[in-house]
Interface confidence: low
Amino acid sequence: EVEKTACPSGKKAREIDESLIFYKKWELEACVDAALLATQMDRVNAIPFTYEQLDVLKHKLDELYPQGYPESVIQHLGYLFLKMSPEDIRKWNVTSLETLKALLEVNKGHEMSPQVATLIDRFVKGRGQLDKDTLDTLTAFYPGYLCSLSPEELSSVPPSSIWAVRPQDLDTCDPRQLDVLYPKARLAFQNMNGSEYFVKIQSFLGGAPTEDLKALSQQNVSMDLATFMKLRTDAVLPLTVAEVQKLLGPHVEGLKAEERHRPVRDWILRQRQDDLDTLGLGLQGGIPNGYLVLDLSMQEALS
């Protein structure tokens, strides 16, 4: 807390400029008018204030706007944003994407801070949904942003926004998140032709059901092993050897290197050894010839 002291003669700030970097904290408090500061916030960012001096400037704005800063001030906070607490930010009403971009720029190159997370939350809630432009902006600054959302939050992403998603944006998503995103991606890309569709949908396939994988196997897509390894185990298990061979195309040879890892390991255990042998890869662990395979899940459904 800065003590209230009178401004020394001749030191009253007429504008926000570099001469203020030489003011002591109490002089800033006494000599800088909060309303002047609010109208000239855009200048603060270009002046090398110390963090301690920024504390004083923040204090002045807090006094002027106890209910939260107006967007005209927020947009020009610049590095002063780093001084804000999540509690400060919860008082704001940020509606402009330009404001959001300006503040994200300040934090660029750093981990997402609690301040940024709160800002994004306020912004998205204010908009009602995660529209394409917002998603474009957020994933540009934070490639992992999508995967930081809960499946419930992801459900508010409209299919049209999926066009903004890049493969790297999904790197840290877990299967539950992909379960939500995949149907949206399928809808978003439904009018594309086969090869183009596969390129776009590939990153989302960790949420694909068996029937969609079967359909893809009929389209000569040549799925790479990295994508195959990210598929849901429960979606892969019902695929036949022939379907997996068609799905992977020339990449089928990669199964050998992955035979001890899920979902390949579990899939092998479900296939007849005879069928696996047709691949000529030396895959072992299939059901021996002459054994009867009972699909217990089917039997439970009937009873």
Epitope: P48, T50, Y51, E52, L54, G78, Y79, L82
Partner: nanobody, 120 residues
Framework: DVQLVESGGGLVQAGGSLRLSCAAS????????MSWHRQAPGKDRELVSS???????HYADSVRGRFTISKGNARNTLYLQMNSLKPEDTAVYFC???????????????WGQGTSVTVS
Amino acid sequence: DVQLVESGGGLVQAGGSLRLSCAASGFPYFSCCMSWHRQAPGKDRELVSSISSDGSTHYADSVRGRFTISKGNARNTLYLQMNSLKPEDTAVYFCAAYPRQLGPYYAMDYWGQGTSVTVS
């Protein structure tokens, strides 16, 4: 590791001169500013002078006209030429560097250990 090492301090009579140096090493780049600060016994650290990447300089009122800040040719050395020294200039002088053009000093800054200047 980033290191800033000051030198050149010492005991000098009032009216005399000293030249402080600050050698910077370990910086991936210098995109911004370097500065000199000082701290007198029992007082807050204060900014004396700063120089930005475009060469523009700033001085505290108390030293303007007497002190000159400059960067060496190698861009990794900072100098402070101090003339007409006064007893009130007695302090520990620190150099600091900020590898970015805008934004607050102390936001992403590096400090040296300081060099002592005593004016009798």
